[in-house]
């Protein structure tokens, strides 16, 4: 599997992973103790035919061209969790692994 | 996890899984021995904010609203393989499990 990495200075128009910091406190999510901020990343860019297609299925649907099927879109194809320390509704401090919080790779699907 | 299922008569505008039969022969993929056709399904529809979002990350990116980030799009969130019998480039008949050929569920990511 392969995906492009870009930054704010990139001129890449194709599907790419960009850096993004999520700041929980800025969202008013003040029940999160740690991390206060984390590197989440996001996907953006164009999905030309076959570029960075994750699944053979994507190619097959494109060929079949059913009614209402949009082209593939730039979306996370590999994600990872982060460990968090947070306050739950019962006033307890909880340690937990929260899945799919970080985009590791972007692709067209 | 939850996803909508629709058919060609549905009036659903939101992200939904639709039936789609892939016909290898119609594509000219004559190296595939079996199956000649299979039920692949596909995803189509709108991703309103928070509807069918697979990842908390999708919500966080929406809140952070970085430059160039499109809204979430309707894409497979669960896929399964199919078993296939096909000719390889060396004219050998191969049996293999091909991953991510069937869409089991659609969601917004």
């Amino acid at each position: 599997d392969f995906g492009l990495d870009c930054d704010e200075h990139s001129t890449e128009s194709r599907c790419c992973r960009y850096p993004l910091t999520v700041d929980f406190e800025a969202f008013g999510w003040d029940w999160i103790i740690a991390p206060k901020r984390y590197k989440a990343n996001y996907c953006s860019g164009e999905c030309e035919f076959v570029f960075l297609q994750k699944y053979p299925h994507t190619h097959l649907v494109h060929q079949a061209n059913p009614r209402g099927s949009a082209g593939p879109c730039c979306t996370p194809t590999k994600m990872s969790p982060i460990n968090m320390l947070y306050f739950n509704g019962k006033e307890q401090i909880i340690y937990g692994k929260i899945p799919a919080m970080v985009v590791d790779r972007c692709g067209c699907s | 996890d939850f996803g909508l299922d629709c058919d060609e008569h549905s009036t659903e505008s939101r992200c939904c899984r639709y039936p789609l039969t892939v016909d290898f022969e119609a594509f000219g993929w004559d190296w595939i021995i079996a199956p000649k056709r299979y039920k692949a399904n596909y995803c189509s529809g709108e991703c309103e904010f928070v509807f069918l979002q697979k990842y908390p990350h999708t919500h966080l990116v929406h809140q952070a609203n970085p430059r160039g980030s499109a809204g979430p799009c309707c894409t497979p969130t669960k896929m399964s393989p199919i078993n296939m019998l096909y000719f390889n480039g060396k004219e050998q008949i191969i049996y293999g499990k091909i991953p991510a050929m069937v869409v089991d569920r659609c969601g917004c990511s």
Epitope: E25, P35, K39, E91, I93 | -
Partner: antibody, heavy 117, light 105 residues
Framework: QVQLVQSGAEVKKPGASVKVSCKAS????????MHWVRQAPGQGLEWMGI????????SYAQKFQGRVTMTRDTSTSTVYMELSSLRSEDTAVYYC??????????WGQGTLVTVSS | SYELTQPPSVSVSPGQTATITCSGH??????VSWYQQGSGQSPVLVIY???QRPSGIPGRFSGSNSGNTATLTISGTQAMDEADYFC????????FGGGTKVTVL
Amino acid sequence: QVQLVQSGAEVKKPGASVKVSCKASGYTFTSYYMHWVRQAPGQGLEWMGIINPSGGSTSYAQKFQGRVTMTRDTSTSTVYMELSSLRSEDTAVYYCARDENWGFDPWGQGTLVTVSS
Amino acid sequence: SYELTQPPSVSVSPGQTATITCSGHALGDKFVSWYQQGSGQSPVLVIYDDTQRPSGIPGRFSGSNSGNTATLTISGTQAMDEADYFCQAWDSSFVFGGGTKVTVL
């Protein structure tokens, strides 16, 4: 200004317990979590746990679970860290530190706990 | 458990640049803070979120982080910068490096 003042040095025997206090001033005590961090002589820093002074809930580093207890007294704006079943390797300077948005800031002046028979 | 590794010591002449490294697996994917601890003193935060300086911290302190290594740079090092420096990151706990003693020759 924000200040964290800790209790004085302690000498304890192996197997005993120690209770270190940290008195906060210059801010709303119940609005900020408090961490405890220790530093053995000539060593690095080691996070021990965190307490929410508002409700008293805690989370401890795995290494100290079962041996550490963090409590607070809102009437005196003081948090406490009690470590039991002391052994020689618990000899260290123990710090309280306020949980700020950007990190541990500020820190108390530290309390030296010596465990010796 | 996650580990952060620092060199035990770094020496620098006054006015020169001191570079302190902190390495850990995919450390660039995490935010790193740096703490300064003078002899017999409590730690003081000098850098957070890889590159940010808290108010009151001189501009000669800067940070970076990519790949497996975070770096604290002290430009135009002064005698008062002689101290121990600790990197810190969040993984499954608050993790600190072993510390680097900066000596101003």
